[in-house]
């Protein structure tokens, strides 16, 4: 059975990219 997430709407939802850095770099080793 399919699990869906997000809210219901008649139009397309915008996916929030706000959880990820815009220009990410690799983690540095300390």
């Amino acid at each position: 059975s399919e699990t869906t997430t997000g809210t219901s709407s008649n139009s397309s939802q915008s996916t929030s990219n706000s959880g990820l850095a815009p220009n990410p770099t690799n983690a540095t080793t300390k």
């Epitope: 997000g6 850095a21 770099t25 540095t28």
Partner: antibody, heavy 115, light 112 residues
């Protein structure tokens, strides 16, 4: 209603290949940064790969463990993202989820690498 | 890689009582634009993960306001002000500041 539906999983032998597909609906797919994340009892949740949108030149990022073996791609006209998995290893076994930048998630498709 | 360490591994909470989960990162998650890309996800039994919170404290649409996130740099907290039966499951923190994106090991929330 937002739906991300993965397909293409199954049983594959070590060294083999498989291609996963994720069909999105109810979402403005062309704007989404798309990721594949896998889950296994041994490693928990593990990020695999990401492909960004056209304004970001469809840049791709990969986990070190899959670099050179896996390829992420997308087709905005079909609202689909793919994961081509080559030279599979037993440690690649798990449930593979596609997700829009960790926002919306699909139900997952199972990949088992075993002889 | 950034290591995300969650505590406790599990907690058992009575309905209506508060719950708190800690997440610590091995490096500061503060990005050069001043934002901190720390997310909280919920995975109910038999379901896929769902994001609750992004950028430390911003609630995703449709998420009840009994959930809240706080913290900075390397120390973060997810709080549920009044636990409900539907909150049972595993909660994960996840960082989106540095590649590769990494997840905490999860905290299992059980209902007493």
């Amino acid at each position: 209603e937002v739906k991300f539906e993965e397909s293409g999983g199954g049983l594959v032998q070590p060294g083999g290949s498989i291609k996963l597909s994720c069909a999105a609906s109810g979402v403005t797919f062309s704007e989404a940064w798309m990721d594949w994340v896998r889950q296994s009892p041994e490693k928990g949740l593990e990020w695999v790969a990401e492909i960004r949108d056209k304004p970001n030149s469809y840049v791709t990022y990969y986990a070190e463990s899959v670099k050179g073996r896996f390829t992420i791609s997308r087709d905005d006209s079909k609202s689909r993202v793919y994961l081509q998995m080559n030279n599979l290893r037993t440690e690649d076994t798990g449930i593979y989820y596609c997700t829009g930048a960790m926002d919306y998630w699909g139900q997952g498709t199972s990949v088992t690498v075993s002889s | 890689d950034i290591v995300m360490t969650q505590t406790p591994l599990s907690l058992s909470v009575t309905i209506g009582q508060p719950a708190s989960i800690s997440c610590k990162s091995s490096q500061s998650l503060l990005y050069s634009n001043g934002k901190t890309y720390l997310n909280w996800l919920q995975q109910r039994p038999g379901q896929s993960p769902k994001r609750l919170i992004y950028q430390v404290s911003k609630l995703d649409p449709g998420i009840p306001d009994r959930f809240s996130g706080s913290g900075s740099e390397t120390d973060f907290t997810l709080k549920i002000s009044r636990v409900e039966a539907e909150d049972l499951g595993i909660y994960y923190c996840m960082q989106g500041t540095y590649l590769p994106w990494t997840f905490g090991g999860g905290t299992k929330l059980e209902i007493k």
